[in-house]
């Protein structure tokens, strides 16, 4: 058992049939010595008396808010949560495995630039009695500060018969240099509590590996005289790190015809303009990636060819 | 082909081309090493990220773009011990900081060159002959060093008489290649920035 925060305790249980569970001793936070009784949650049933209460925690029915009373007045509370370990592996029932970029990916994080600001998100099908808290640092043995904001419900989606909820959090490294060469990874720890179940999820990454630029902006087409070619131009996204000559992007450009079967012509360029040929009903798209470190490509920015 | 992009003319800044080759070689060599050593801890998540140039050079700080010099988080350890001139420099316009920066890059390359050569000598004694560095990566390091054209005493290759631990040597190679790739990214950014300036 360990303290998650004041008056909230996590009991770690090996979860298998007929498991012995954990013996837990609760102590009433009071100078009183006599006439103390204990109850669990809203039930008025007295579980024991005395300054301490010893219980065997085996299942969720044994978890909850234990309260010690004297003369009808509550003296202190202890909330017990369960953290299940099955076959030596901590449970991951609350969050959905996003399977990207690999299996057992529960937290996904992205950064739009090298400023030390990043966003992490996770998915769940649970809609009620759910709370999250997030901590982050650079490195674990001698951690350097990262400040995270409040967790927000960022999206709701219908997936077949289920509703899926996306939660996200924004974090900022306290003293980040965009040009720095990262040697220690950022660690992100998410505590998830659903009713009386506690789970924790972690992710470890370098900012350079989670970079995903915003799409190029101000995409423009200029037709060339007596030709079905157009001069296309675009600009670096506003959110990308500066100076652009140091934090350079490379671009992938494509012309996509009206039918998905039609072959896509793709080329790569470091410039912010190109000459393309527009087919009927085609659209022109461009995406960006860090020129020197192959992290994610941005989403496509698109414009109709004509 | 339905798309066309004009190819750029020759770069004004002669080191840019060499730094691009350096990054390509660093990335390709690392990728190849990860494939060959797939059963060794050789991924970014598995290795310790060491920096053999730590406390010896200050490339990131010395080569900071002017726009980031105001950022206090970037100025933890300003090193100002190097000053000299080289053929990549645009002669009179060369600033003190630019000379310092290029000198620091040169020193990085020299250190990695020694480490890679020492490691290669060990790996060539491995009876499995599982992995060793091809001449490409050593060649591009050499080309960029020549383009930087700093006079520097040659560092002797470290020799070792005892039989190497090949497992440890291969892990060390992974660590070295990861670190070198990160430094090659910084070098390429710097050269691109200087070329644009």
């Amino acid at each position: 058992i360990w303290e998650l925060k004041k008056d909230v305790y996590v009991v770690e249980l090996d979860w298998y049939p007929d498991a012995p569970g954990e013996m837990v001793v609760l102590t009433c936070d009071t100078p009183e010595e006599d006439g103390i009784t204990w109850t669990l949650d809203q039930s008025g049933e007295v579980l024991g008396s005395g300054k301490t209460l010893t219980i065997q925690v085996k299942e969720f029915g044994d978890a909850g808010q234990y309260t010690c009373h004297k003369g009808g007045e509550a003296l202190s509370h202890s909330l017990l949560l369960l953290h299940k370990k099955e076959d030596g592996i901590w449970s991951t029932d609350v969050l959905k495995d996003q399977k990207e970029p690999k299996n057992k990916t529960f937290l996904r994080c992205e950064a739009k630039n090298y400023s030390g600001r990043f966003t992490c998100w996770w998915l769940t099908t649970i809609s009620t009695d759910l709370t999250f808290s997030v901590k982050s640092s650079r490195g674990s043995s001698n951690p350097q500060g990262v400040t995270c904001g409040a967790v927000t419900l960022s999206a709701e989606r219908v997936r077949g018969d289920n509703k899926e909820y996306e939660y996200s959090v924004e974090c900022q490294e306290d003293s980040a240099c965009p040009a720095a060469e990262e040697r220690l990874p950022i660690e992100v720890m998410v505590d998830a509590i659903h009713k009386l179940k506690y789970e924790n999820y972690t992710s470890s990454f370098f900012i350079r590996d989670i970079i995903k630029p915003d799409p190029p902006k101000n995409l423009q087409l200029k037709p060339l005289k007596n030709s079905r070619q157009v001069e296309v131009s675009w600009e670096y996204p506003d959110t990308w790190s500066t100076p652009h000559s140091y934090f350079s992007l490379t671009f992938c450009i494509q012309v996509q015809g009206k039918s998905k079967r039609e072959k896509k012509d793709r080329i790569f360029t470091d410039k912010t303009s190109a000459t393309v040929i527009c087919r009927k009903n085609a659209s022109f798209s461009v995406q960006a990636q860090d020129r020197y470190y192959s992290s994610s490509w941005s989403e496509w920015a698109s414009v109709p060819c004509s | 082909r339905n798309l066309s992009v004009a190819t750029p003319g020759p770069e004004m800044f002669p080191c840019l081309h060499h730094s691009q080759n350096l990054l390509k070689a660093a990335s390709n060599t690392l990728q190849k090493a990860r494939q060959i050593l797939e059963f060794y801890p050789c991924t970014s998540e598995e290795i310790d990220h060491e920096d053999i140039t730590k406390d010896k050079t200050s490339t990131v700080e010395a080569c900071l773009p002017l726009e980031l010099i105001k950022n206090e988080s970037c100025l933890n350890s300003r090193e100002t011990s190097f000053i000299t001139n080289g053929s990549c420099l645009a002669s009179r316009k060369t600033s003190f900081m630019m000379a310092l920066c290029l000198r620091s890059i040169y020193e990085d390359l020299k250190m990695y060159q020694v480490e890679f050569k020492t490691m290669n000598a060990k790996l060539l004694r491995d009876p499995k002959r599982q992995i060793f560095l091809d001449q490409n990566i050593l060649g591009v390091i050499d080309e960029l060093m020549q383009a930087l054209n700093f006079n520097s005493e040659t560092v002797p290759q470290k020799s070792s008489l005892e039989e190497p631990d090949f497992y440890k040597t291969k892990i060390k190679l992974c660590i070295l290649l990861h670190a070198f790739r990160i430094r090659a990214v910084t070098i390429d950014r710097v050269m691109s920035y200087l070329n644009a300036s």
Epitope: N226, S227, R228, Q229, K258, I277, R279, K280, N281, S306 | -
Partner: antibody
Framework: QSLEESGGRLVTPGTPLTLTCTVS????????MNWVRQSPGKGLEWIGA?????GTAYANWAKGRFTISKTSTTVDLQIASPTTEDTATYFC????????????????WGPGTLVTVSS | AVLTQTPSPVSATVGGTVTIKCQSS????????LSWYQQKPGQPPKLLIY???TLASGVPSRFSGSGSGTQFTLTISGVQCDDAATYYC???????????FGGGTEVVVV
Amino acid sequence: QSLEESGGRLVTPGTPLTLTCTVSGFSLSTYTMNWVRQSPGKGLEWIGAISYDGGTAYANWAKGRFTISKTSTTVDLQIASPTTEDTATYFCARGFYVYAYIGDAFDPWGPGTLVTVSS
Amino acid sequence: AVLTQTPSPVSATVGGTVTIKCQSSQTVYKNNLLSWYQQKPGQPPKLLIYLASTLASGVPSRFSGSGSGTQFTLTISGVQCDDAATYYCLGGYDDDADTAFGGGTEVVVV
């Protein structure tokens, strides 16, 4: 920039025939080429086209009856099994624009070659 | 697609104005992929107007084109004897296979 059709002659029904359009002064890799025909005393009929990248398109009535192909300086129109209704002057015409859409303006035109199908 | 040209034939006097209409059974691509041609006996057609209203180079300014979508017009103002010919419209569509010429309008100058 010139175009010239050749291969027009008298053929019996069912005898395959290939007409050739030879171009000069421009590149077929940047221009779309069209075949158009005109029966005696009648109007113009678009048969089909081959685009700069080698893609082909045919009028609905012409599909399966005609095949268009090209080399670096020639464009061929193959008539698989001519009938008397295919008697006409056959023109090749270039797309007016570089990388023209199919259906874009046609300019210049060749002088035409006459095909007579008769038994 | 079917392109219907009216009227045919049309008679014109020198110095007068001739208007030829071209109606498409479906909207041409981007509302303007329509061109006009002039053909004289024994000659190949000659491009006059492209993109519905743009005059091809070397074509006298007395020729003009207008219209959009499915209705288009070729106008010859100040008709000259040399304008006696057959005029065709050509439409391009979303589906390349629908590309087609109109039936032609013969202009007789008296």
